[in-house]
């Protein structure tokens, strides 16, 4: 149940896909990855107001309980709904290999 | 990659399963659910410090970039890794039905 995509907080303030440029050093990968030297990391950032992109029933419950008990129950959180695969050229004991990672780059986002 | 389960912030402070008692009124279900009158809602609450219960590579990246750019990139978030099913007796146009929901109660938690 992907609820409303209208952000009541204003354009770009709610949970959505952002791109953050990061070097191998930024990611702590310099010692085991050769390429790419820089990654366009796609990640999910933004607020999750009531029913915005609610991933499921649990997210809806969380919204209701957060409204009642904000100090106890946090608001839903903006996280990846799916991922795009990515390859890395990584160092091995004997040289290099090309490895695919399926859980590295967010493809789209929801609130949970 | 479920990384370290040791919480550096002290016992119970990091991402884990909590139970929150909620009435049908609390959940906004009173108009369509007959039973149960009260639900022991299991949900994921707590901080996600560096590499604590990191769900995948994306969570590890998020930790690294949050450390570098805390104002831009949020820390990983404590969310359900899986769910327990739950049945609700719900009102229908003609009476009641027993419906199973697979995405209502968190079973265990991770950081993403």
């Amino acid at each position: 149940a992907r609820n409303g995509d209208h952000c009541p907080l204003g354009p770009g303030r709610c949970c959505r896909l952002h791109t953050v440029r990061a070097s191998l050093e930024d990611l702590g990968w310099a010692d085991w990855v050769l390429s790419p030297r820089e990654v366009q990391v796609t990640m999910c950032i933004g607020a999750c107001p009531s029913q915005f992109r609610a991933a499921n029933m649990h997210a809806q419950i969380k919204t209701s309980l957060h409204r009642l008990k904000p100090d106890t129950v946090p608001a839903p959180c903006c996280v990846p709904a799916s991922y795009n695969p990515m390859v890395l050229i990584q160092k091995t004991d004997t040289g290099v290999s090309l490895q695919t990672y399926d859980d590295l780059l967010a493809k789209d986002c929801h609130c949970i | 990659a479920r990384n370290g389960d040791h919480c550096p912030l002290g016992p119970g402070r990091c991402c884990r399963l909590h139970t929150v008692r909620a009435s049908l009124e609390d959940l906004g279900w009173a108009d369509w659910v007959l039973s149960p009158r009260e639900v022991q809602v299991t949900m994921c609450i707590g901080a996600c410090p560096s590499q604590f219960r990191a769900a995948n590579m994306h969570a590890q990246i998020k930790t690294s970039l949050h450390r570098l750019k805390p104002d831009t990139v949020p820390a990983p978030c404590c969310v359900p890794a899986s769910y327990n099913p739950m049945v609700l007796i719900q009102k229908t146009d003609t009476g009641v039905s027993l419906q199973t929901y697979d995405d209502l109660l968190a079973k265990d938690c991770h950081c993403i």
Partner: antibody
Framework: QVQLQESGPGLVKPSETLSLTCTFS??????????VGWIRQPPGKGLEWIAH???????YFNTALKSRLTISKDTSKNQVSLKLSSVTAADTAVYYC??????????WGQGTLVTVSS | DIQMTQSPSSLSTSVGDRVTITCKAS??????VAWYQQKPGKAPKFLIY???YRYTGVPDRFSGSGSGTDFTFTISSLQPEDFAVYYC?????????FGQGTKVEIK
């Protein structure tokens, strides 16, 4: 496992357009960092890189051939197409496509011989 | 475009011998040189990445070194299946360019 196969006409007349297709399996051209490149080898000669296309649709071409080249991809069909216009006898070669991960060309097709002759 | 010049163009050698091929770039390419092996009628096979890194599954008798403009490819002890043509290629910048090849023949 990764496999690539080139297909083309075999024989092309001078001044016509050569159309080649690379059909692949075992990887996806929607994966960040993945590309498909074309390389050719005239009979008895060395290798010449022609062009490549990336997952994000960025394209790069051999400087000398650039004005005659078109490259495109169909991610859903796992295919990359190359077109070379205004061919001459000098374009006679075995044409290979190769899977690329950044600057690694690790898997190659078996090649297809294209002869330019009237 | 960056030119890659290989030497020698061919060499005759025997099983068990050590073989060294050199490749010179027309400008600094850092360590961005790859090496390929090609047997008659077959597609090239990727051997070495970024001057010195053996690709997955490549036997350790194959090695590479160098940076800047001068690069070396070595087969420490030639095996019967190693008789082939070897190419260097710069992957520093497009257009990617290959050396003209070195044919390793049986003496």
């Amino acid at each position: 496992q990764v496999q690539l196969q080139e297909s083309g006409p075999g024989l092309v007349k001078p001044s016509e357009t050569l159309s080649l297709t690379c059909t692949f399996s075992g990887f996806s051209l929607s994966t960040y960092g993945i590309g498909v490149g074309w390389i050719r080898q005239p009979p008895g000669k060395g290798l010449e890189w022609i062009a490549h296309i990336w997952w994000n649709n960025n394209k790069y071409f051999n400087t000398a051939l650039k004005s005659r080249l078109t490259i495109s991809k169909d991610t859903s069909k796992n295919q990359v197409s190359l077109k070379l216009s205004s061919v001459t006898a000098a374009d006679t070669a075995v044409y290979y496509c190769a899977r690329m991960g950044y600057d690694i060309m690790d898997y190659w097709g078996q090649g297809t011989l294209v002869t330019v002759s009237s | 475009d960056i030119q890659m010049t290989q030497s020698p163009s061919s060499l005759s050698t025997s099983v068990g011998d050590r073989v060294t091929i050199t490749c010179k770039a027309s400008q600094d390419v850092n360590t961005a040189v790859a090496w390929y092996q090609q047997k008659p009628g077959k597609a090239p096979k990727f051997l070495i990445y970024s001057s010195s890194y053996r690709y997955t599954g490549v036997p350790d008798r194959f090695s590479g070194s160098g940076s800047g403009t001068d690069f070396t490819f070595t087969i420490s002890s030639l095996q019967p299946e190693d008789f082939a043509v070897y190419y260097c290629q710069q992957h520093y910048s497009t257009p990617w360019t290959f050396g003209q090849g070195t044919k390793v023949e049986i003496k």
